[in-house]
Interface confidence: low
Amino acid sequence: FEIALPRESNITVLIKLGTPTLLAKPCYIVISKRHITMLSIKSGERIVFTFSCQSPENHFVIEIQKNIDCMSGPCPFGEVQLQPSTSLLPTLNRTFIWDVKAHKSIGLELQFSIPRLRQIGPGESCPDGVTHSISGRIDATVVRIGTFCSNGTVSRIKMQEGVKMALHLPWFHPRNVSGFSIANRSSIKRLCIIESVFEGEGSATLMSANYPEGFPEDELMTWQFVVPAHLRASVSFLNFNLSNCERKEERVEYYIPGSTTNPEVFKLEDKQPGNMAGNFNLSLQGCDQDAQSPGILRLQFQVLVQHPQNESNKIYVVDLSNERAMSLTIEPRPVKQSRKFVPGCFVCLESRTCSSNLTLTSGSKHKISFLCDDLTRLWMNVEKTISCTDHRYCQRKSYSLQVPSDILHLPVELHDFSWKLLVPKDRLSLVLVPAQKLQQHTHEKPCNTSFSYLVASAIPSQDLYFGSFCPGGSIKQIQVKQNISVTLRTFAPSFQQEASRQGLTVSFIPYFKEEGVFTVTPDTKSKVYLRTPNWDRGLPSLTSVSWNISVPRDQVACLTFFKERSGVVCQTGRAFMIIQEQRTRAEEIFSLDEDVLPKPSFHHHSFWVNISNCSPTSGKQLDLLFSVTLTPRTVDLT
């Protein structure tokens, strides 16, 4: 190899040992029969050398540094050449370094031809191995602007007082151009300006200078985003730290064309703007730090640019001003992440504060819009508390458990609407009366409607789930002893069409001791399946539930249990089942922890089934499934 550097080219070439690889045989640079491990070639020198091994790229790296002095004479602006040409260099991992020194009043601009640059964070690497490391200078201190790969959005970086650009090329890479040019600009009066150009949808992750270390004290850094006017941009902070400020406050400032409040100032902890149309600037301003304990300011953020959906121009009014104790959350539904670019999906409050989830509370009118490619990626969860504190006032009072139409009109699927129903302890109980009789969801007869009601105790210490119920069954009402939550859960988008089928009224009634009472009026056409609460986990200890089963005059009911024994083993107390004819009060009592369950029995009149649990041993729980079937009476037994 022969490297000749022209006189006054201000180029230095350094060949040195790189990161050692585990190779048994050492390798040397051979020059005039001498074996050396480092070679430095300065301007005006011509050196001929070889390597003592077949694969020098496993041992050595080459650095080519060009110092450009803009202090003492004119600056060589324009396209930057790779000197010496890569074809004249040995095939080693090579780093071209350009060190440009300029006056504080001179702005320097690096312009990157396509492909533009993409910033990478600590520990990341570029797929093709080609990296651009860019540094600036504040007085004598070097400041790292960032490390970049190809195929990104960064088109220009402006600095003043000097710039150091290092282009790293792997030994096998054929690139023979620098890919950038230098231009002079007037003073930018800040550390740097990074221009990021979006031609279509996409995202960019960017970082403050020196990231992940601290941003220089009391400095200002600006990012200029060039975004087509028909697209929308949203900013989200991925990671940030605040330093300990003695004077001034750390902040970000947005310059948004068309905004009447430019610049818009945000704290780093604030929700950042979204749904911005067209170009905008973002600036990070540091503060005067506490000398004793400065801390660090750092910021890593993402800009997401995407098409506005039809929805993003629509404002939805969610009027919760007449509601009390209610919160509505719009959030992403859980999905598996895909590896390809997925446009963001945001919900925006007042069109500007956008985030992936949003909670609206009662007492106000809220204006929301969406910035989302596919609104099925979001769903809504609502929680409303209806509580009674004074039993004298509430008794016999009724409330309709209906999803407000304002919520149904939103373009996002409702997932859960939960009513927390709270009563004064030992004073009142609750009754739920559906508009349409309910079916209990069982394995034998699952619900296939677009929604169900999930009824569970809302007493923190009590693990009691009454079950899942959907319209179209035989359960006329459900009475519960104390606080419960009723959740309307939707299972299909067709809920919007079926919304009229929802309707549940809750009334506060005099207190009763049983945990729950189900009133069942079977239809002649179908078999009614009923199961004890807390299926799969077992009826809680010492809990009693009843079913009031109506039998019409001309029918006979067949009561069938689906196993021979209950399976419960009592630690203390006894588990009982009482089947009682309502007309004659005649009753049969079964010891569930001892007796076999009754064979199918026929009932000509309305009857009760009451099940009371003991304190069971763990693993031997009480779970019962039974059915009621009506058939016409063949003989009049009255």
Epitope: N244, K267, E269, S327, T329, T359, T361, N381, E383
Partner: antibody, heavy 116, light 110 residues
Amino acid sequence: EVQLVESGGGLVQPGGSLRLSCAASGFNLYSYYIHWVRQAPGKGLEWVASIYPYYSSTSYADSVKGRFTISADTSKNTAYLQMNSLRAEDTAVYYCARYYYAMDYWGQGTLVTVSS
Amino acid sequence: DIQMTQSPSSLSASVGDRVTITCRASQSVSSAVAWYQQKPGKAPKLLIYSASSLYSGVPSRFSGSRSGTDFTLTISSLQPEDFATYYCQQGYAGSWHPITFGQGTKVEIK
């Protein structure tokens, strides 16, 4: 240096009221969630209430809903817990804590005793 | 509300022992789970946030991990100053489910 200092605790009769203060220094109160957490003698920690002063959004544990009110005065960099209709079971050390990924800074606590 | 069931409620261990404390969430939760250490008469101190991130200034013998709805705090080699009560906590400020703490685990000297 980040610091939280609670005050306002003391002995109060059942049904009475108390107002606890949590004075913050070293950070802006309105940028963080502030929580009140209590600990009854010999018992574990129980979350009581939280406020995000920037949006004035509040939430409460079921056990104190309707009786306790959390608020903040950002000009004084102080959060408050107004406790009404106090019961014996409200007896505890009350801590205020700042939330940033977790409750990273806590006050020293103030003791509230509800007894006749 | 989401319950955090912490186990064991107490344990006896010796200096140098590896100690594991578990919290099980009653339903699926985000990774907004933190662990705190509390000594008698003192306020709790944050050890772990976001299920597995070590808070600054906390010795590296403390670590946190997650598996489904189970969250674990591990002390790799117990030191004399580690004898205290440890609490897990789920929920993040303003989340729909209120913040809840585990019942606590008292780590005592064997």
